[in-house]
């Protein structure tokens, strides 16, 4: 059967059931995707506009495919296997009463099953499997995939990367030369490159092999761990650091007062809740903000977003995307994009990838 031929998969909730709070729907769907990402290399991200790989729809009766719903009971939901268009989409019967608990029909449990189909799984004959064709409530707090579910999904996608399976529970220093190492954010700061991961950053001084690891809090005690995006405007000695919907300004390596501020002051629409990566290009005096599978371009002189954005990353950065973890600018012509444990040297003048590297290639591993 079909499978997704990529590991970054986007989903979008088209509309919400009135049976539940929107936040509870978001949470149930997010946790359902997490069930599958925990046992595979797949990464799921929610987008709020544009074309997602997997569209989540609540509908009743005839709703745009051949498989009309049948009212309360009976068919609860259905999902299409991987593919373009309707491929991957998951439809939930609005005539059911969707809940967060054992009453009605539990959305999380149903979504885990349907997302299994969205990823290419068929039904299981094991009654303990979530992919068994009939719905049965189990305690969602202790819910686990069966061995059969795990075998099935890993036969399609493999098992998770080491750094996913071992999520650094005690926040100990990540192994710098782990081939699966990924970064949260990367930026130049003068002649140095800062690589952020969890509560740490590595400092790489250009052209020198030595790298040092530091706690973010040791340099900037007022900043949080888990920085998600960063960029530098070298001419102003400014570094911008992002986490969730907030950003901090660092001037001459010192945090500015009156921060953090909301990312929406840059002009992002309300649905943008966090920035994945950011990079400033001094040639154009523009900053590129990457959010899920899209990017915005910000004019640092006029202090406003350029019109015509967001655009799809894959459309305008050939071979990059659909989603990235980090990016920085170097040598006057390259962006270095990070996707998981891989890194791509991208010549923005030629508009193509010129080298593929491991993310930790800067450290002489």
């Amino acid at each position: 059967g079909p499978v997704w031929r990529k590991h970054y998969i986007t989903y979008r909730i088209n509309n919400y059931t009135p049976d539940m709070n929107r936040e509870d729907v978001d949470y149930a769907i997010r946790k359902a995707f997490q069930v599958w990402s925990n046992v595979t290399p797949l990464k799921f991200s929610k987008i709020n506009t544009g074309m997602a790989d997997i569209l989540v729809v609540f509908a009743r009766g005839a709703h745009g495919d051949f498989h009309a719903f049948d009212g309360k009971g009976g068919i609860l939901a259905h999902a299409f296997g991987p593919g373009s268009g309707i491929g991957g989409d998951a439809h939930f019967d609005e005539d059911e009463f969707w809940t967060t608990h054992s009453g009605g029909t539990n959305l999380f449990l149903t979504a885990v099953h349907e997302i299994g189909h969205s990823l290419g799984l068929g039904h299981s004959s094991d009654p303990k499997a979530v992919m068994f064709p009939t719905y049965k409530y189990v305690d969602i707090n202790t819910f686990r995939l069966s061995a059969d579910d795990i075998r099935g999904i890993q036969s399609l996608y493999g098992d998770p990367k080491e750094n996913q399976r071992l999520p650094n529970p005690d926040n100990s220093e990540p192994a710098l030369c782990d081939p699966n190492l990924s970064f949260d954010a990367v930026t130049t700061v003068g002649n140095k490159i800062f690589f952020f991961k969890d509560r740490f950053f590595w400092l790489k001084v250009s052209e020198r092999p030595k790298t040092s690891v530091n706690l973010i809090s040791s340099l900037w005690p007022t900043l949080p761990s888990g920085i998600e995006a960063a960029y530098e405007i070298e001419a102003r000695n400014q570094v911008f650091l992002f986490k969730d919907d907030k950003y901090w300004l660092i001037s001459n390596l010192r945090p500015e007062p009156n921060y953090p501020k909301s990312i929406h002051s840059f002009g992002f629409p309300n649905f943008v809740k966090k920035i994945d990566a950011a990079v400033f290009n001094p040639r154009f005096y523009r900053t590129y903000f990457f959010v899920d599978n899209q990017y915005w371009r910000y004019d640092e002189r006029r202090q406003m977003m350029d019109p015509g954005y967001p655009k799809l990353i894959t459309k305008n950065f050939q071979g990059i995307g659909p989603k990235i973890d980090a990016v920085f600018y170097s040598k006057n012509k390259y962006y270095y994009f990070f996707q998981g444990s891989n890194q791509f040297e991208y010549d923005f003048l030629l508009q193509r990838i010129t080298k593929t590297l491991k993310s930790n290639s800067w450290f002489g591993c």
Epitope: L55, G64, D65, F66, G81, G83, I86
Partner: antibody, heavy 122, light 103 residues
């Protein structure tokens, strides 16, 4: 190269029966939904019926429900449409169409046959 | 039940013109809309699926847009071979068709 070749059309009297066949080649037939779509002379396209990969489920347009039966033989890579109680308004070119999907059908037809003409007239 | 309304039913245009055909559903069909081209005596051919995705081999002058209930097919610069009938379709429902003729 994907090919769909319809046969079995012809002239039949009202109330009569015909069985259309569609021979598929150039792709693995069994995983895909298959459909019949018709077009009356000088008119638009009308979806008639669809069938799932293993012979079910089956769906029918209201206009032919109870009179036509869709079936398939995956071992022969062939789709069928049994048409009973034919009426003058069933006169049309009947096309066989391959769906892009298996499991569930979204109704996206990526390949079509050339059609076979069914004429219902006394 | 879902219904599709296509307009106009016929259209006269010249080579090089930009042409737009619209299709409206009576309820949301998300992006589950396809467009087909049919020439006289031939079977229909898939042009665009999922509202805006160009089928492999179809010239880039064809484009589709829309979601929910309103959709459009645009031909940016008509070529002689584009004079045909165009149908929108969603699952088992086709629009009435738009016949595109030479002016």
């Amino acid at each position: 190269e994907v090919q769909l070749l319809e046969s079995g059309g012809g002239l039949v009297q009202p109330g009569g029966s015909l069985r259309l066949s569609c021979a598929a080649s150039g792709f693995t037939f069994s995983p895909y939904w298959m459909h019949w779509v018709r077009q009356a002379p000088g008119k638009g396209l009308e979806w008639v019926s669809g069938i799932g990969p293993s012979g079910g489920p089956t769906f029918y347009a209201d206009s032919i429900k109870g009179r036509f039966t869709i079936s398939r033989d995956n071992s022969k890579n062939t789709l069928y449409l049994q048409m009973n109680s034919l009426r003058a308004e069933d006169t049309a070119v009947y096309y066989c169409a391959k769906d892009i999907r298996g499991a569930y059908s979204g109704g996206l037809f990526d390949y079509w046959g050339r059609g076979t003409l069914v004429t219902v007239s006394s | 039940d879902i219904q599709m309304t296509q307009s106009p039913s016929s259209l006269s245009a010249s080579v090089g013109d930009r042409v737009t055909i619209t299709c409206r559903a009576n309820q949301s069909i998300y992006t589950y809309l396809n467009w087909y081209q049919q020439k006289p005596g031939k079977a229909p051919e898939l042009l665009i699926y999922a509202a805006s995705s160009l089928q492999s081999g179809v010239p880039s002058r064809f484009s589709g847009s829309g979601s929910g209930t309103d959709f459009t097919l645009t031909i940016s610069s008509l070529q002689p071979e584009d004079f045909a009938t165009y149908y929108c379709q969603q699952a088992g429902i086709f629009g009435q068709g738009t016949k595109l003729e030479i002016k």
